[in-house]
């Protein structure tokens, strides 16, 4: 005659928390709390986050979803992943650009802007490390070029061009005398 014994629910546990009168089961990620449960250990009334909002974790008390962030066009940011009900927009830099943090102690949530990556080829240098999280790391001069000051200078193609010591070392095969 007695009803089936309900499973024990611990208000201090992960699945149930006291919301209002009762311990209620939380809302899943991507849902917000419309109304708490109306019986001990019951299910709360949960609704899907509206467009352009999200909640990333199971929650018990969020009665509204967080607004999705907009990527900062002024900082040349682009959306790497669009916002969904369960995850915020992931902003980053388009290919050929890298993240330059705006604070010294840089973490994933730090403000940043996008900088165009150095084009090692245009500088006549080898690409030692491709640009992604930081700027491109350029290496030594490409064949046919030698170090001169901060740049790479093309080996002379005729005896008319002067060829200092470093030039001679790299471009010796081109020298006529």
């Amino acid at each position: 005659q007695g009803g089936t014994r309900s499973p024990r629910c611990d208000c201090a546990g992960d699945f149930h928390k006291k919301i209002g009168l009762f311990c209620c089961r939380g809302c899943p990620a991507g849902h917000y709390l419309k109304a708490p449960c109306t019986e001990p250990c019951g299910n709360s009334t949960c609704l899907v986050c509206p467009q352009d909002t999200f909640l990333a974790w199971e929650n018990h008390h969020n009665s509204e979803c967080a607004r999705c962030q907009a990527c900062d066009e002024q900082a040349s940011q682009v959306a790497l992943e669009n916002c969904s009900a369960v995850a915020d927009t992931r902003c980053g830099c388009k290919p050929g650009w890298f993240v330059e943090c705006q604070v010294s102690q840089c973490v994933s949530s730090s403000p940043f802007y996008c900088q165009p990556c150095l084009d090692c080829g245009a500088l006549h240098r080898h690409t030692r490390l491709l640009c992604s999280r930081r700027d491109t790391d350029c290496g030594t001069c490409l064949p046919g070029f030698y170090e001169h000051g901060d740049g790479c200078v093309s080996c002379p193609t005729s005896t008319l061009g002067s060829c200092p010591e470093r030039c001679a070392a790299v471009c010796g095969w081109r020298q006529m005398f």
């Epitope: 309900s6 208000c11 919301i19 209002g20 009168l21 109306t38 019986e39």
Partner: antibody
């Protein structure tokens, strides 16, 4: 000792509004859920609303949802029932109750009741 | 909603005799081994009084001639030896789930 003193009842026309108050004393008001129960003339008891302690969530039956609001002012040890869009069928004596929680089962019983205040909805 | 049905609607018992009032719920009001139901007494011009909670626990200050029993869906309030001051209307009520619901009441009189 424990007391729940009610006020705010009276005669109101259909579609009108009324605000009931319940002043509590003799216990730590903020630690208890509180309810309103009503009793139509010559009829039984009907639950009208409950407000939780702490986070002040409110609950209503369908018969009054979207017309009634319950609120509490813990600083003033007071409970309120704002009744809008009143209908003839809302005519009743309204009781304020203290809801005591028993054990870890999240189980409530109305352990103290006010004397009631009469609300008459009539044109 | 959980419907609570009391029987009888009215009852006349001689002083010193046993009075029994029944209450049936339309579904179980049991939770975690406890029956979430109570009994109240209503006398004219007095606040209602909680007599029994969790089906069988007598509220402090209530005379021990009052007792409650039952589980699941069927419950009983018993007054072992009726006294003149017990003339009142008695209500059962469930707290298993919202909306909280009451029985229609049983009027107890002296025969």
């Amino acid at each position: 000792q424990m007391q729940l003193v009610q006020s705010g009842g009276g005669l109101v026309k259909p579609g009108g509004s009324l605000r009931l108050s319940c002043a509590a004393s003799g216990f730590t008001f903020s630690s208890y859920a509180m309810s309103w129960i009503r009793q139509a003339p010559g009829k039984g008891l009907e639950w009208v609303s409950t407000i939780s302690d702490g986070d002040s969530y409110s609950y209503f039956p369908d018969s009054v949802k979207d017309r009634f609001t319950i609120s509490r002012d813990n600083a003033k040890n007071s409970l309120y029932l704002q009744m809008n869009s009143l209908r003839a069928e809302d005519t009743a004596v309204y009781y304020c109750t203290r809801d005591r929680i028993y054990g870890s089962v999240q189980y409530y019983a109305m352990d103290y009741w006010g004397r009631g205040t009469l609300v008459t909805v009539s044109s | 909603d959980v419907v609570m049905t009391q029987s009888p609607d009215s009852l006349a018992v001689s002083l010193g005799e046993r009075a029994t009032i029944s209450c049936r719920a339309s579904e179980s009001v049991e939770f975690s081994g406890t029956s979430l139901m109570q009994w109240y007494q209503q006398k004219p011009r007095q606040p209602l009084k909680l007599l029994i909670y969790a089906a069988s626990n007598v509220e402090s200050g209530v005379p021990d001639r009052f007792s409650g029993s039952g589980s699941g869906t069927d419950f009983t309030l018993t007054i072992s030896s009726l006294q003149a001051e017990d003339v009142a209307v008695y209500y059962c009520q469930q707290s298993r789930k919202l909306p909280y619901t009451f029985g229609q009441g049983t009027r107890l009189e002296i025969k």
